[in-house]
C-alpha cells in the first residue's frame, strides 16, 4: 500500500536538486578564488540537513545555521544591490557592472537561485511533486526560511551607500511584505549604512512621471529615516538605455537623464 503523501499547493522540488546544488557549488568555488577553500560536499550535507526529515512547515533559521557558517563570504559592503520584484534587471545590471553584487551573486544565493525544495517529516525523501506555498500553506517552509535567513545576513553586511532596484510598474512599488520590505530594510545597520538609494525602474516607454513621489516610496523613506539612514531616490525612465550606459558610459547619449 503506497504511503500517503502530503499534497502541498506549491510546485515540488526542482528536478535534480541535489546534483544542481553540488554542481553550482563546485562551479562557484572554481570561479571565485576567495571561496576555493569551501568543501562542496559539506555544503550539500549542511543544506540537506536543514530540511530533510523535517516537517516542511516547521523550518527555522537555526536549521540553516550550519549552512550559513560554511557559506560565510565577504563581499565589498559598499557595493551591494538589493532588489524587489525586478530580479531580471538587477541580475542584468550586475552582469555588466561586475563590481556590484546582488544576493544571487554570492555563493549561498547562487546555490538556491530559481530553485524550490522541501522534504517530508520523518523520511529522508525529497518531495519532487509539491512543496508548501508561502500564502496557501505556511510561511515557515524551507525555501522562504532560507531566503529570509540569507537576506537578513546580506543586509546586515551592507555599508556606506546601499542601492535597491524597485519595480515602478507594480501597484506597490515598495511592498512592506516583500523580502526587501520585511527583512532587508529592517536589517540595514544604521552605524554602517549612510544612505539607501532607490532606483525606481519605469516600465512604460512614455512614462515620464516622477515615481519617487509615489506614496509607497514615501513610506519607504519614512521607515529608513526613522532608522537614522538617509534616503535618496532616482527614476530610471529607460532601463534599456540605463544598461547600455552602464556598459558604455562614454556614449554621447549617456549624459542625458535615463
Amino acid at each position: 500500500v503506497p504511503r500517503w503523501r502530503q499534497q502541498w499547493s506549491g510546485p515540488g522540488t526542482t528536478k535534480r536538486f541535489p546534483e544542481t546544488v553540488l554542481a553550482r557549488c563546485v562551479k562557484y568555488t572554481e570561479i571565485h578564488p576567495e571561496m576555493r577553500h569551501v568543501d562542496c560536499q559539506s555544503v550539500w550535507d549542511a543544506f540537506k540537513g536543514a530540511f530533510i526529515s523535517k516537517h516542511p512547515c516547521n523550518i527555522t533559521e537555526e536549521d540553516y545555521q550550519p549552512l550559513m557558517k560554511l557559506g560565510t563570504q565577504t563581499v565589498p559592503c559598499n557595493k551591494i544591490l538589493l532588489w524587489s520584484r525586478i530580479k531580471d534587471l538587477a541580475h542584468q545590471f550586475t552582469q555588466v557592472q561586475r563590481d556590484m553584487f546582488t544576493l544571487e551573486d554570492t555563493l549561498l544565493g547562487y546555490l538556491a537561485d530559481d530553485l524550490t525544495w522541501c522534504g517530508e517529516f520523518n523520511t529522508s525523501k525529497i518531495n519532487y511533486q509539491s512543496c508548501p506555498d508561502w500564502r496557501k500553506d505556511c510561511s515557515n517552509n524551507p525555501v522562504s526560511v532560507f531566503w529570509k535567513t540569507v537576506s537578513r545576513r546580506f543586509a546586515e553586511a551592507a555599508c556606506d551607500v546601499v542601492h535597491v532596484m524597485l519595480n515602478g510598474s507594480r501597484s506597490k512599488i515598495f511592498d512592506k511584505n516583500s523580502t526587501f520590505g520585511s527583512v532587508e530594510v529592517h536589517n540595514l545597520q544604521p552605524e554602517k549604512v549612510q544612505t539607501l538609494e532607490a532606483w525606481v525602474i519605469h516600465g512604460g516607454r512614455e512614462d515620464s512621471r516622477d515615481l519617487c513621489q509615489d506614496p509607497t516610496i514615501k513610506e519607504l523613506e519614512s521607515i529608513i529615516s526613522k532608522r537614522n539612514i538617509q534616503f535618496s531616490c532616482k527614476n530610471i525612465y529607460r532601463p534599456d538605455k540605463f544598461l547600455q550606459c552602464v556598459k558604455n558610459p562614454e556614449d554621447s547619449s549617456c549624459t542625458s537623464e535615463i
Epitope: A23, D88, D114
Partner: antibody, heavy 126, light 110 residues
C-alpha cells in the same frame, strides 16, 4: 513565471540570412543553457544547437555547422540564432527551449528542455 | 534515417494503457538520459519525463518512463481524449556530440 518569448514570423528568399531572437524572463538567464530546435511543416523535432549564456559557448548539430550562429546578450536576457545561406528546406518553426542548469552541464550530458518558446515561423521562398 | 526510432503511430481507447517505444544505440540511449515530450496540435512541445523515469512537478502520475539497454518506453495509463498528441523521445548522442530526437509518435485516442 518562467517564460521564453520569441520574435515574429519571417519570410526570406533563398540565400538570405535570418536572425531569430528569444527573450527569457522569470529566472536568472545566465544559469541555464538555451537550445534551439526546429520543426519543418508536418515533420518531427530537429535539434539545431545550444548556447550557454554565461560566456556564450555553443554546440551545433553537425549539419548546421558553419551556417548557424548563436549569440547571447546578458543585458537583455536574450539569445539569438542567425541562419545564413537559407534554403527552402530551412522553412520551419524554430523553437528556443531552456535546457539544464549550466553548472550541471559541466558534469553531465543532460538533454531535456523544461520551458519552450512559442516558436518563430521562418518561411524561405523565392 | 533517424538515429533514434519511434513507431509512427499508436492508438488505444479511453481509459486504456498505451506504451510508446524509442530505440537507439549505445552512443545515445544506452549511455545517456532519455526525456519525453508531448506536442499538442499547433503548440510547443512540453516536457513529460526526464532522466528516463522522472516526472516534472505538475505532470500527472499517469505518465511514466523506463529505460532498458538501448531502448526507452513511455507509458500512459487511463488514456484521455486530451492525450491525443505527438510524442517525442530525446537524448544526447555522445558520438555525434549532439542532441537527437526520435521521429515522433502520433497517439490517437479512439
Amino acid at each position: 513565471q518562467v517564460q521564453l518569448v520569441e520574435s515574429g514570423a519571417e519570410v526570406k528568399k533563398p540565400g538570405a540570412s535570418v536572425k531569430v531572437s528569444c527573450r527569457a524572463s522569470g529566472y536568472t538567464f545566465t544559469n541555464y543553457h538555451l537550445h534551439w530546435v526546429r520543426q519543418a511543416p508536418g515533420q518531427g523535432l530537429e535539434w539545431v544547437g545550444t548556447i550557454n549564456p554565461r560566456g556564450g559557448s555553443t554546440t551545433y548539430a553537425q549539419k548546421f555547422q558553419g551556417r548557424v550562429a548563436m549569440t547571447s546578450d546578458t543585458s537583455t536576457s536574450t539569445v539569438y540564432m542567425e541562419v545564413n545561406r537559407l534554403r527552402s528546406d530551412d522553412t520551419a518553426v524554430y523553437f528556443c527551449a531552456r535546457g539544464s542548469d549550466n553548472a550541471l552541464a559541466d558534469f553531465y550530458n543532460y538533454y531535456d528542455m523544461d520551458v519552450w518558446g512559442q516558436g518563430t515561423t521562418v518561411t524561405v521562398s523565392s | 534515417q533517424a538515429v533514434v526510432t519511434q513507431p509512427p503511430s499508436v492508438s488505444a481507447a479511453p481509459g486504456q494503457k498505451v506504451t510508446i517505444s524509442c530505440s537507439g544505440s549505445s552512443s545515445n540511449i544506452g549511455n545517456n538520459y532519455v526525456s519525453w515530450y508531448q506536442q499538442l496540435p499547433g503548440t510547443a512541445p512540453k516536457l513529460l519525463i526526464y532522466d528516463n523515469n522522472e516526472r516534472p512537478s505538475g505532470i500527472p502520475g499517469r505518465f511514466s518512463g523506463s529505460k532498458s539497454g538501448t531502448s526507452a518506453t513511455l507509458g500512459i495509463t487511463g488514456l484521455q481524449t486530451g492525450d491525443e498528441a505527438d510524442y517525442y523521445c530525446g537524448t544526447w548522442d555522445s558520438s555525434l556530440s549532439a542532441g537527437v530526437f526520435g521521429g515522433g509518435t502520433k497517439l490517437t485516442v479512439l
